[in-house]
């Protein structure tokens, strides 16, 4: 939900067609009753389209009105279209809901590239392919927007899953997940498996496909392989974490680790790209260019503006390096690394001119607001947002796209000293200068 290529996110298919799935490994962590195991009813409850966001079906009001809602860990408002809009097939009609309550308050939310405003109220909300509960939640009824809704995306609202600190108009507006936990017995955690397709999807393919899973209140073993590794949530506003080291094909970028987290590093399902602070982006691109120098790409490609295409099935994945981010671990002086493949950071797009080619955009971009671990990162991993224990877990996703030579990885432990020094302390400024997630 940060800036850059935000909100509009990309998704894809789950299941076998996604490419090779890794075999399950035994889970070394002890069971935590009520939080781990099988959540069959929630598996495969996300859909989406490359670059346009992963969404879950929700119902709002009485009688229930069904809407598709973008899952966004980079913002904290639950907001739905509530007026006709050219890009919406349907919208929330408050006047038809007997349980709607007007909060008599307006709200305005600017993202980097989109904005909306609306009126606050509360209503009964449930997630059909989620926990079997109904909660009264705050809802922003969007009455006016600019570059927010996306033509053909098939979602009509946004579910901000981050913390109250970044809710608009202020932190007194309780976010949906807080209401859910407070009003039910759902444990205070959720997990996301976002499944990139590895190839572009047309409208009908998206509607027929699975884009992943949002497991509310728990962890599903079938969605990941190997072990879960946890990094502390540094501060409960965005899902802020600390990156302590970055490697391209095993080569350390050798920057002051504060640069990696300037001015923050967040995990954001509502952003398409891996977004990096200017200095880090420049160093990373330089290193990726060097590693892939057997082929030359135009500058526009590295800026995320131009496609590169190869004849179908001939994409030279092997010339592109893997990227490893080392995250602060739960134990003092201990870190772990998550490694993504070019299959994650080269985003498949449809080439208008020739459908015989496989075309891609470079999905790493520059940020002025810190590191954003968007879909490019998340599509490689099963990500556990363990709010109860103030930590985020990463494991290799059972649906990540890879080839026969390399897979995404989560590995540790590594010894890393003085990791606390890697965090950047944002000077206290007026809260009103905060940009809410998305772009």
């Amino acid at each position: 939900t940060q800036h850059g290529i935000r909100l509009p996110l990309r998704s894809g298919l789950g299941g076998a067609p996604l490419g090779l799935r890794l075999p399950r490994e035994t889970d070394e962590e002890p069971e935590e009753p009520g939080r781990r195991g099988s959540f069959v009813e929630m598996v495969d409850n996300l859909r989406g389209k490359s670059g346009q966001g992963y969404y879950v079906e929700m119902t709002v009001g009485s009688p229930p009105q069904t809407l598709n809602i973008l899952v966004d860990t980079g913002s904290s408002n639950f907001a739905v279209g509530a007026a006709p809009h050219p890009f919406l097939h349907r919208y929330y009609q408050r006047q038809l809901s007997s349980t709607y309550r007007d909060l008599r308050k307006g709200v305005y939310v600017p993202y980097t590239q989109g904005k909306w405003e609306g009126e606050l109220g509360t209503d009964l909300v449930s997630i059909p392919h989620g926990p079997n509960v109904t909660v009264r939640a705050n809802i922003a009824a969007i009455t006016e927007s600019d570059k927010f809704f996306i033509n053909g995306s098939n979602w009509e609202g946004i579910l901000g899953l981050a913390y109250a600190e970044i809710a608009r108009p202020d932190d007194s507006l309780e976010p949906f997940f807080d209401s859910l936990v407070k009003q039910t017995h759902v444990p205070n955690l959720f997990s996301l498996q976002l499944c990139g397709a590895g190839f572009p999807l047309n409208q009908s393919e998206v509607l027929a496909s699975v884009g992943g899973s949002m497991i509310i209140g728990g962890i599903d073993h079938s969605l990941y392989t190997g072990s879960l590794w946890y990094t502390p949530i540094r501060r409960e506003w965005y899902y802020e974490v600390i990156i302590v080291r970055v490697e391209i094909n095993g080569q350390d970028l050798k920057m002051d680790c504060k640069e990696y987290n300037y001015d923050k590093s967040i995990v954001d399902s509502g952003t398409t790209n891996l977004r990096l602070p200017k200095k880090v982006f420049e160093a990373a691109v330089k290193s990726i260019k060097a590693a892939s120098s057997t082929e030359k790409f135009p500058d526009g490609f590295w800026l995320g503006e131009q496609l590169v295409c190869w004849q179908a099935g001939t994409t030279p994945w092997n010339i592109f390096p893997v990227i490893s981010l080392y995250l602060m671990g739960e134990v003092t002086n201990q870190s772990f690394r998550i490694t993504i493949l070019p299959q994650q950071y080269l985003r498949p797009v449809e080439d208008v001119a020739t459908s015989q080619d496989d075309c891609y955009k470079f999905a790493i971009s520059q940020s002025s607001t810190g590191t954003v671990m968007g879909a490019v990162i998340m599509e490689g991993f099963y990500v556990v947002f363990d709010r109860a224990r103030k930590r985020i877990g990463f494991a290799v996703s059972a649906c990540h796209v890879h080839d026969e030579f390399r897979t995404a990885a989560v590995e540790g432990p590594f010894v890393t000293l003085d990791m606390e020094d890697c965090g950047y302390n944002i000077p206290q400024t007026d809260e009103s200068t905060l940009m809410t997630g998305r772009a």
């Epitope: 308050k105 405003e117 006016e144």
Partner: antibody, heavy 124, light 107 residues
Framework: EVQLLESGGGLVQPGGSLRLSCAAS????????MGWVRQAPGKGLEWVSA????????YYADSVKGRFTISRDNSKNTLYLQMNSLRAEDTAVYYC?????????????????WGQGTLVTVSS | EIVLTQSPATLSLSPGERATLSCRAS??????LAWYQQKPGQAPRLLIY???NRATGIPARFSGSGSGTDFTLTISSLEPEDFAVYYC?????????FGGGTKVEIK
């Protein structure tokens, strides 16, 4: 220079209707929220209604809800206030005001300048 | 409804003096509060928005402060043209409401 010129005021009987207009110039009308504020003779100010730039967001004071309708014609750079079922307490000078942005609820998006007003008198 | 109470109702001061006008909200309006000035026979004009930001073209002698429920408009040194009625207004909650006004008159 921004200009806002209200018209359509006058004397009307209780229960009657009037339509106020506000002709705007000197700025991109469609990219600004617009509003109506009224002031009864010798009294303070009261917000009546406001609309966002495209007309998606609309605000009404409780005292006029269901009786007054705000609308805008962005092709004519004109804001309207249709007032039905008028009451004696609606007697006031009605000011048209320009918003600070297209948004109705954005911080910083306050209303300024205002027109010189048009007097509406509801009396039998 | 949020009630804005302005005090004093009238402030009698001489040019060059400092004027301090108060606006108290019946519940928090965060920083969604503005101040307008109105002279006889004229439309109001915006002085301060979002509690403390000076509107375009407003002299530096006007300043606003406060958040939540207590707000102050200060005119550091009154000029002859500053004698007028001052209104605070909130847009935090519906209905948007004005205070009753403070009249600053020449002593």
């Amino acid at each position: 220079e921004v200009q806002l010129l209200e018209s359509g005021g006058g004397l009307v009987q209780p229960g009657g209707s009037l339509r106020l207009s506000c002709a705007a110039s000197g700025f991109t009308f469609s990219s600004r929220a617009m509003g109506w504020v009224r002031q009864a003779p010798g009294k303070g100010l009261e917000w009546v209604s406001a609309t966002s730039g495209s007309g998606g967001s609309i605000y009404y004071a409780d005292s006029v809800k269901g009786r007054f309708t705000i609308s805008r014609d962005n092709s004519k750079n004109t804001l309207y206030l249709q007032m039905n079922s008028l009451r004696a307490e609606d007697t006031a000078v009605y000011y048209c005001a320009k918003g600070g942005s297209q948004w109705l609820y954005a911080p910083g998006s306050w209303f300024d300048p205002w027109g010189q007003g048009t007097l509406v008198t509801v009396s039998s | 409804e949020i009630v804005l109470t302005q005090s004093p109702a009238t402030l009698s001061l001489s040019p060059g003096e400092r004027a301090t006008l108060s606006c108290r909200a019946s519940q928090s309006v965060s920083s969604y509060l503005a101040w307008y000035q109105q002279k006889p026979g004229q439309a109001p004009r915006l002085l301060i928005y979002d509690a403390s930001n000076r509107a375009t073209g407003i002299p530096a002698r006007f300043s606003g402060s406060g958040s939540g429920t207590d707000f102050t408009l200060t005119i550091s040194s009154l000029e002859p043209e500053d004698f007028a009625v001052y209104y605070c207004v909130q847009r935090s909650n519906f209905p948007w409401t004005f205070g009753g006004g403070t009249k600053v008159e020449i002593k």
